[in-house]
Amino acid sequence: KPTCDEKYANITVDYLYNKETKLFTAKLNVNEKVECGNNTCTNNEVHNLTECKNASVSISHNSCTAPDKTLILDVPPGVEKFQLHDCTQVEKADTTICLKWKNIETFTCDTQNITYRFQCGNMIFDNKEIKLENLEPEHEYKCDSEILYNNHKFTNASKIIKTDFGSPGE
Protein backbone atom coordinates (compact mmCIF):
# COMPACT_ATOMS: atom_id res chain seq x y z
CA LYS A 1 0.00 0.00 0.00
CA PRO A 2 1.19 3.55 -0.64
CA THR A 3 1.41 5.98 2.26
CA CYS A 4 -1.52 8.39 2.58
CA ASP A 5 0.99 11.22 2.28
CA GLU A 6 1.93 9.88 -1.17
CA LYS A 7 -1.57 8.91 -2.26
CA TYR A 8 -3.06 12.33 -1.49
CA ALA A 9 0.03 14.39 -2.33
CA ASN A 10 -1.77 16.33 -5.06
CA ILE A 11 -5.20 16.59 -3.47
CA THR A 12 -7.16 19.67 -4.53
CA VAL A 13 -9.77 21.61 -2.60
CA ASP A 14 -12.79 23.73 -3.46
CA TYR A 15 -14.04 26.37 -1.03
CA LEU A 16 -17.79 26.91 -0.69
CA TYR A 17 -19.11 29.93 1.20
CA ASN A 18 -22.21 30.07 3.39
CA LYS A 19 -23.56 33.63 3.33
CA GLU A 20 -25.71 33.06 6.42
CA THR A 21 -23.03 31.70 8.74
CA LYS A 22 -20.19 33.55 6.94
CA LEU A 23 -18.16 30.34 7.15
CA PHE A 24 -16.49 28.20 4.48
CA THR A 25 -16.70 24.52 3.69
CA ALA A 26 -13.64 22.89 2.11
CA LYS A 27 -14.60 20.14 -0.35
CA LEU A 28 -11.80 17.59 -0.74
CA ASN A 29 -11.58 16.40 -4.32
CA VAL A 30 -11.02 12.67 -3.79
CA ASN A 31 -12.87 9.65 -5.16
CA GLU A 32 -13.15 7.63 -1.92
CA LYS A 33 -14.56 8.64 1.44
CA VAL A 34 -11.57 9.71 3.56
CA GLU A 35 -11.14 10.35 7.26
CA CYS A 36 -9.89 13.66 8.58
CA GLY A 37 -8.31 12.99 11.97
CA ASN A 38 -9.28 15.59 14.57
CA ASN A 39 -11.19 17.68 12.02
CA THR A 40 -14.37 15.76 11.39
CA CYS A 41 -15.25 15.67 7.75
CA THR A 42 -18.60 14.64 6.36
CA ASN A 43 -18.68 13.29 2.81
CA ASN A 44 -15.17 14.63 2.17
CA GLU A 45 -16.13 18.11 3.34
CA VAL A 46 -14.57 20.07 6.21
CA HIS A 47 -17.16 22.46 7.63
CA ASN A 48 -17.25 25.72 9.60
CA LEU A 49 -13.96 27.20 8.47
CA THR A 50 -13.37 30.85 9.42
CA GLU A 51 -12.18 33.24 6.73
CA CYS A 52 -8.44 33.92 6.60
CA LYS A 53 -7.61 31.29 9.21
CA ASN A 54 -5.48 28.29 8.34
CA ALA A 55 -6.79 24.86 9.29
CA SER A 56 -4.78 21.64 9.32
CA VAL A 57 -6.46 18.40 8.22
CA SER A 58 -4.92 14.95 8.59
CA ILE A 59 -6.20 12.78 5.72
CA SER A 60 -6.25 8.97 5.97
CA HIS A 61 -7.98 6.01 4.31
CA ASN A 62 -7.82 2.24 4.65
CA SER A 63 -6.25 1.99 1.18
CA CYS A 64 -3.07 3.71 2.39
CA THR A 65 -0.71 3.57 5.35
CA ALA A 66 0.88 6.05 7.73
CA PRO A 67 2.01 8.75 7.58
CA ASP A 68 -1.27 10.53 6.86
CA LYS A 69 -1.44 13.43 4.43
CA THR A 70 -1.36 16.72 6.35
CA LEU A 71 -3.31 19.24 4.34
CA ILE A 72 -3.13 22.93 5.25
CA LEU A 73 -6.37 24.66 4.29
CA ASP A 74 -5.74 28.30 3.37
CA VAL A 75 -9.21 29.65 3.98
CA PRO A 76 -10.05 32.62 1.69
CA PRO A 77 -11.64 35.94 2.67
CA GLY A 78 -15.42 36.13 2.96
CA VAL A 79 -17.12 36.36 -0.42
CA GLU A 80 -19.37 39.27 0.59
CA LYS A 81 -16.29 41.47 1.01
CA PHE A 82 -15.93 41.63 -2.78
CA GLN A 83 -18.32 43.32 -5.19
CA LEU A 84 -18.06 43.37 -8.97
CA HIS A 85 -18.70 46.98 -9.88
CA ASP A 86 -19.52 48.51 -13.26
CA CYS A 87 -17.20 51.53 -13.42
CA THR A 88 -18.10 52.57 -16.98
CA GLN A 89 -18.34 56.35 -17.39
CA VAL A 90 -21.77 57.37 -18.70
CA GLU A 91 -20.32 59.59 -21.42
CA LYS A 92 -18.20 56.70 -22.77
CA ALA A 93 -20.77 53.91 -22.38
CA ASP A 94 -21.30 53.55 -26.13
CA THR A 95 -17.81 52.16 -26.83
CA THR A 96 -16.36 51.35 -23.39
CA ILE A 97 -16.85 48.78 -20.64
CA CYS A 98 -15.20 49.15 -17.24
CA LEU A 99 -15.42 46.48 -14.53
CA LYS A 100 -13.77 46.50 -11.14
CA TRP A 101 -13.70 44.23 -8.11
CA LYS A 102 -14.23 46.47 -5.09
CA ASN A 103 -13.07 45.41 -1.64
CA ILE A 104 -15.77 46.91 0.51
CA GLU A 105 -14.36 45.47 3.74
CA THR A 106 -10.89 44.75 5.05
CA PHE A 107 -9.81 41.21 5.93
CA THR A 108 -6.72 39.64 7.44
CA CYS A 109 -5.80 37.35 4.52
CA ASP A 110 -2.64 38.39 2.70
CA THR A 111 -3.81 40.50 -0.25
CA GLN A 112 -0.75 39.36 -2.19
CA ASN A 113 -2.21 35.86 -2.41
CA ILE A 114 -5.34 37.10 -4.17
CA THR A 115 -5.57 36.87 -7.96
CA TYR A 116 -8.28 38.38 -10.12
CA ARG A 117 -9.25 37.08 -13.54
CA PHE A 118 -11.59 38.45 -16.19
CA GLN A 119 -12.66 36.79 -19.41
CA CYS A 120 -14.62 38.88 -21.90
CA GLY A 121 -15.13 36.89 -25.08
CA ASN A 122 -11.70 35.54 -25.98
CA MET A 123 -9.84 38.22 -24.02
CA ILE A 124 -8.35 37.27 -20.64
CA PHE A 125 -7.05 39.75 -18.06
CA ASP A 126 -5.36 39.03 -14.74
CA ASN A 127 -6.35 42.35 -13.21
CA LYS A 128 -8.62 43.67 -10.49
CA GLU A 129 -9.99 46.36 -12.81
CA ILE A 130 -10.45 46.24 -16.58
CA LYS A 131 -11.38 48.80 -19.19
CA LEU A 132 -12.36 47.67 -22.70
CA GLU A 133 -12.33 50.45 -25.28
CA ASN A 134 -13.24 50.90 -28.95
CA LEU A 135 -16.21 48.52 -28.70
CA GLU A 136 -19.21 48.43 -31.01
CA PRO A 137 -22.14 50.60 -29.86
CA GLU A 138 -25.36 48.76 -28.97
CA HIS A 139 -23.71 45.38 -28.59
CA GLU A 140 -24.01 42.88 -25.76
CA TYR A 141 -20.77 41.77 -24.13
CA LYS A 142 -20.44 39.06 -21.49
CA CYS A 143 -17.60 39.16 -18.99
CA ASP A 144 -16.92 36.33 -16.56
CA SER A 145 -14.69 36.96 -13.59
CA GLU A 146 -13.30 34.96 -10.72
CA ILE A 147 -11.15 35.58 -7.66
CA LEU A 148 -8.58 33.08 -6.46
CA TYR A 149 -6.86 32.82 -3.10
CA ASN A 150 -3.60 30.88 -3.24
CA ASN A 151 -4.76 29.68 -6.68
CA HIS A 152 -8.07 28.33 -5.34
CA LYS A 153 -11.15 29.93 -6.84
CA PHE A 154 -13.47 31.10 -4.08
CA THR A 155 -15.90 33.40 -5.84
CA ASN A 156 -16.98 34.34 -9.35
CA ALA A 157 -19.40 36.65 -11.07
CA SER A 158 -20.62 37.39 -14.58
CA LYS A 159 -21.85 40.61 -16.11
CA ILE A 160 -23.68 41.09 -19.38
CA ILE A 161 -23.25 44.67 -20.47
CA LYS A 162 -24.89 46.28 -23.44
CA THR A 163 -23.04 49.26 -24.84
CA ASP A 164 -25.13 52.38 -25.45
CA PHE A 165 -26.35 53.75 -28.77
CA GLY A 166 -23.65 55.65 -30.61
CA SER A 167 -24.05 59.41 -30.99
CA PRO A 168 -25.99 60.50 -34.09
CA GLY A 169 -23.70 60.89 -37.09
CA GLU A 170 -21.09 58.44 -35.80
Epitope: C87, K100, K102, N103, I104, E105, Q112, I114, N127, K131
Partner: antibody, heavy 119, light 113 residues
Framework: EVQLVESGGDLVKPGGSLKLSCAAS????????MSWVRQTPEKRLEWVAY????????YYPDTVKGRFTISRDNAKNTLYLQMSSLKSEDTAMYYC????????????WGAGTTVTVSS | DVLMTQTPLSLPVSLGDQASISCRSS???????????LEWYLQKPGQSPKLLIY???NRFSGVPDRFSGSGSGTDFTLKISRVEAEDLGVYYC??????????FGGGTKLEIK
Protein backbone atom coordinates in the same frame (compact mmCIF):
# COMPACT_ATOMS: atom_id res chain seq x y z
CA GLU B 1 10.45 42.11 -0.33
CA VAL B 2 7.64 44.59 -0.91
CA GLN B 3 9.17 47.90 -1.94
CA LEU B 4 8.31 51.31 -3.38
CA VAL B 5 11.15 53.50 -4.63
CA GLU B 6 10.50 57.09 -5.69
CA SER B 7 12.72 59.08 -8.05
CA GLY B 8 12.67 62.27 -10.13
CA GLY B 9 12.73 64.86 -7.36
CA ASP B 10 14.71 67.99 -8.21
CA LEU B 11 15.09 71.74 -7.81
CA VAL B 12 12.74 73.48 -10.24
CA LYS B 13 11.75 77.10 -10.88
CA PRO B 14 8.17 78.34 -10.18
CA GLY B 15 5.97 77.64 -13.21
CA GLY B 16 8.16 74.69 -14.19
CA SER B 17 7.32 71.01 -14.59
CA LEU B 18 8.62 67.76 -13.15
CA LYS B 19 7.73 64.08 -13.43
CA LEU B 20 8.12 61.77 -10.46
CA SER B 21 8.29 57.98 -10.71
CA CYS B 22 7.67 55.24 -8.19
CA ALA B 23 8.99 51.76 -8.96
CA ALA B 24 7.08 48.96 -7.23
CA SER B 25 8.45 45.48 -6.56
CA UNK B 26 7.63 42.40 -4.52
CA UNK B 27 3.84 42.51 -5.03
CA UNK B 28 1.14 42.35 -7.71
CA UNK B 29 1.19 46.08 -8.51
CA UNK B 30 -1.84 45.89 -10.83
CA UNK B 31 -4.09 44.80 -7.93
CA UNK B 32 -3.40 47.85 -5.79
CA UNK B 33 -4.70 51.40 -5.83
CA MET B 34 -1.86 53.88 -5.39
CA SER B 35 -1.43 57.39 -4.03
CA TRP B 36 1.04 60.22 -3.82
CA VAL B 37 1.33 61.90 -0.42
CA ARG B 38 3.63 64.85 0.24
CA GLN B 39 5.25 66.20 3.39
CA THR B 40 5.85 69.93 3.57
CA PRO B 41 8.96 71.46 5.18
CA GLU B 42 6.70 72.14 8.21
CA LYS B 43 6.16 68.35 8.40
CA ARG B 44 2.46 68.43 7.43
CA LEU B 45 1.26 65.42 5.42
CA GLU B 46 -0.97 66.15 2.41
CA TRP B 47 -2.59 63.62 0.10
CA VAL B 48 -2.07 64.84 -3.50
CA ALA B 49 -3.29 62.15 -5.92
CA TYR B 50 -4.99 58.76 -6.09
CA UNK B 51 -5.28 56.22 -8.91
CA UNK B 52 -7.26 52.98 -9.03
CA UNK B 53 -5.61 49.63 -9.72
CA UNK B 54 -6.28 49.64 -13.46
CA UNK B 55 -5.80 53.38 -13.88
CA UNK B 56 -9.48 53.98 -14.59
CA UNK B 57 -10.20 56.40 -11.74
CA UNK B 58 -8.06 59.31 -10.57
CA TYR B 59 -8.70 61.78 -7.74
CA TYR B 60 -6.99 65.01 -6.65
CA PRO B 61 -7.49 67.64 -3.95
CA ASP B 62 -8.35 71.15 -5.18
CA THR B 63 -4.83 72.38 -4.35
CA VAL B 64 -3.29 70.41 -7.23
CA LYS B 65 -6.26 69.71 -9.53
CA GLY B 66 -5.48 70.73 -13.12
CA ARG B 67 -1.74 70.96 -12.41
CA PHE B 68 -0.86 67.40 -11.33
CA THR B 69 -1.60 64.17 -13.21
CA ILE B 70 -1.23 60.73 -11.68
CA SER B 71 -0.77 57.75 -14.01
CA ARG B 72 0.57 54.23 -13.93
CA ASP B 73 2.12 51.61 -16.20
CA ASN B 74 1.14 48.23 -14.79
CA ALA B 75 3.37 46.43 -17.30
CA LYS B 76 6.36 48.31 -15.86
CA ASN B 77 5.13 48.25 -12.24
CA THR B 78 5.55 52.00 -12.12
CA LEU B 79 3.50 54.90 -10.78
CA TYR B 80 3.98 58.48 -12.05
CA LEU B 81 3.15 62.00 -10.98
CA GLN B 82 3.39 64.67 -13.67
CA MET B 83 3.55 68.09 -12.02
CA SER B 84 3.23 71.34 -13.95
CA SER B 85 2.76 75.05 -13.12
CA LEU B 86 4.72 74.36 -9.95
CA LYS B 87 4.48 76.79 -7.05
CA SER B 88 6.74 77.36 -4.04
CA GLU B 89 4.07 75.70 -1.85
CA ASP B 90 4.59 72.45 -3.79
CA THR B 91 8.02 72.17 -2.16
CA ALA B 92 7.91 68.91 -0.23
CA MET B 93 9.05 65.35 0.18
CA TYR B 94 6.84 63.24 -2.13
CA TYR B 95 5.96 59.69 -1.09
CA CYS B 96 4.14 57.05 -3.06
CA UNK B 97 1.96 54.78 -0.97
CA UNK B 98 -0.01 51.60 -1.57
CA UNK B 99 -3.70 51.24 -0.66
CA UNK B 100 -5.42 47.98 -1.61
CA UNK B 101 -8.74 49.72 -2.13
CA UNK B 102 -10.31 53.04 -1.22
CA UNK B 103 -11.69 51.48 1.97
CA UNK B 104 -8.36 50.09 3.11
CA UNK B 105 -5.23 51.82 4.43
CA UNK B 106 -1.75 52.92 3.33
CA UNK B 107 0.25 49.85 4.34
CA UNK B 108 3.42 50.40 2.29
CA TRP B 109 5.23 53.70 1.73
CA GLY B 110 8.33 54.58 -0.25
CA ALA B 111 11.29 56.48 1.23
CA GLY B 112 10.31 59.64 -0.67
CA THR B 113 11.86 62.02 -3.20
CA THR B 114 12.44 65.74 -2.61
CA VAL B 115 10.93 68.44 -4.81
CA THR B 116 12.09 72.03 -4.28
CA VAL B 117 10.36 74.86 -6.11
CA SER B 118 12.45 78.00 -5.91
CA SER B 119 13.77 80.73 -8.17
CA ASP C 1 -13.07 69.60 3.07
CA VAL C 2 -12.84 67.63 6.30
CA LEU C 3 -10.37 69.27 8.68
CA MET C 4 -8.55 66.96 11.10
CA THR C 5 -7.27 68.69 14.25
CA GLN C 6 -4.77 66.94 16.49
CA THR C 7 -3.91 67.85 20.08
CA PRO C 8 -1.48 68.32 21.60
CA LEU C 9 1.07 69.54 19.08
CA SER C 10 3.87 68.22 21.25
CA LEU C 11 3.66 65.55 23.96
CA PRO C 12 6.63 65.20 26.33
CA VAL C 13 6.49 61.86 28.19
CA SER C 14 8.67 59.74 30.43
CA LEU C 15 9.46 56.21 29.27
CA GLY C 16 6.92 53.80 30.75
CA ASP C 17 4.22 56.46 31.02
CA GLN C 18 0.88 56.41 29.20
CA ALA C 19 0.44 58.80 26.28
CA SER C 20 -2.82 59.98 24.77
CA ILE C 21 -3.29 61.85 21.48
CA SER C 22 -6.58 63.37 20.39
CA CYS C 23 -7.87 63.82 16.85
CA ARG C 24 -11.05 65.74 16.05
CA SER C 25 -12.73 65.97 12.63
CA SER C 26 -14.65 69.05 11.49
CA UNK C 27 -17.58 66.80 10.50
CA UNK C 28 -18.62 63.22 11.10
CA UNK C 29 -16.41 60.68 9.38
CA UNK C 30 -18.87 57.82 9.70
CA UNK C 31 -19.37 56.55 6.17
CA UNK C 32 -22.83 55.69 4.83
CA UNK C 33 -21.78 52.02 4.90
CA UNK C 34 -21.46 52.26 8.69
CA UNK C 35 -17.68 52.14 8.85
CA UNK C 36 -15.40 54.89 10.13
CA UNK C 37 -12.18 55.09 8.14
CA LEU C 38 -9.92 56.71 10.74
CA GLU C 39 -6.27 55.68 10.68
CA TRP C 40 -3.18 56.48 12.75
CA TYR C 41 0.35 56.63 11.34
CA LEU C 42 3.72 57.01 13.08
CA GLN C 43 6.65 58.70 11.42
CA LYS C 44 9.95 58.10 13.16
CA PRO C 45 12.84 60.54 12.53
CA GLY C 46 14.30 60.08 9.03
CA GLN C 47 11.69 57.48 8.03
CA SER C 48 8.47 57.40 6.03
CA PRO C 49 5.14 57.06 7.88
CA LYS C 50 4.05 53.61 9.08
CA LEU C 51 0.51 52.40 9.67
CA LEU C 52 -0.46 51.68 13.29
CA ILE C 53 -4.28 51.62 13.46
CA TYR C 54 -7.03 51.40 10.86
CA UNK C 55 -10.81 51.77 11.11
CA UNK C 56 -10.52 53.55 14.49
CA UNK C 57 -9.39 50.62 16.62
CA ASN C 58 -7.87 47.83 14.51
CA ARG C 59 -4.15 47.30 15.08
CA PHE C 60 -2.19 46.65 11.90
CA SER C 61 -0.16 43.42 11.83
CA GLY C 62 3.02 43.64 13.87
CA VAL C 63 1.87 46.66 15.88
CA PRO C 64 2.38 46.07 19.64
CA ASP C 65 -0.74 45.84 21.79
CA ARG C 66 0.35 48.83 23.86
CA PHE C 67 -1.14 50.89 21.01
CA SER C 68 -4.92 51.26 21.02
CA GLY C 69 -7.37 53.42 19.14
CA SER C 70 -10.85 54.50 20.15
CA GLY C 71 -13.55 57.07 19.40
CA SER C 72 -16.54 57.67 17.16
CA GLY C 73 -18.23 60.33 15.05
CA THR C 74 -15.81 63.27 15.25
CA ASP C 75 -13.63 62.47 18.30
CA PHE C 76 -10.85 59.92 18.26
CA THR C 77 -7.97 58.98 20.55
CA LEU C 78 -4.72 57.05 20.21
CA LYS C 79 -3.34 55.67 23.46
CA ILE C 80 0.08 54.19 24.15
CA SER C 81 -0.12 52.34 27.45
CA ARG C 82 3.62 52.27 28.28
CA VAL C 83 5.80 54.46 26.09
CA GLU C 84 9.04 52.90 24.87
CA ALA C 85 11.99 54.67 23.24
CA GLU C 86 11.06 53.23 19.82
CA ASP C 87 7.65 54.95 20.00
CA LEU C 88 9.13 58.42 19.68
CA GLY C 89 8.24 60.33 16.53
CA VAL C 90 5.32 62.19 14.99
CA TYR C 91 1.83 60.66 15.06
CA TYR C 92 -0.73 61.54 12.39
CA CYS C 93 -4.42 60.77 12.24
CA UNK C 94 -6.03 60.38 8.82
CA UNK C 95 -9.58 60.16 7.53
CA UNK C 96 -10.47 58.05 4.51
CA UNK C 97 -14.26 58.17 4.85
CA UNK C 98 -14.84 61.14 2.57
CA UNK C 99 -13.40 59.55 -0.56
CA UNK C 100 -11.71 60.94 -2.52
CA UNK C 101 -10.94 63.89 -0.22
CA UNK C 102 -8.44 62.21 2.08
CA UNK C 103 -7.05 64.38 4.89
CA PHE C 104 -4.33 64.06 7.55
CA GLY C 105 -4.17 65.70 10.95
CA GLY C 106 -1.38 68.16 11.64
CA GLY C 107 0.68 65.71 13.68
CA THR C 108 1.65 65.25 17.32
CA LYS C 109 5.31 64.96 18.27
CA LEU C 110 5.94 62.43 21.02
CA GLU C 111 9.22 63.24 22.78
CA ILE C 112 11.10 62.42 25.96
CA LYS C 113 10.39 64.67 28.93
Amino acid sequence: EVQLVESGGDLVKPGGSLKLSCAASGFAFSNYDMSWVRQTPEKRLEWVAYISSGGVSTYYPDTVKGRFTISRDNAKNTLYLQMSSLKSEDTAMYYCARRYDVWWYFDVWGAGTTVTVSS
Amino acid sequence: DVLMTQTPLSLPVSLGDQASISCRSSQSIVHSNGNTYLEWYLQKPGQSPKLLIYKVSNRFSGVPDRFSGSGSGTDFTLKISRVEAEDLGVYYCFQGSHVPMYTFGGGTKLEIK
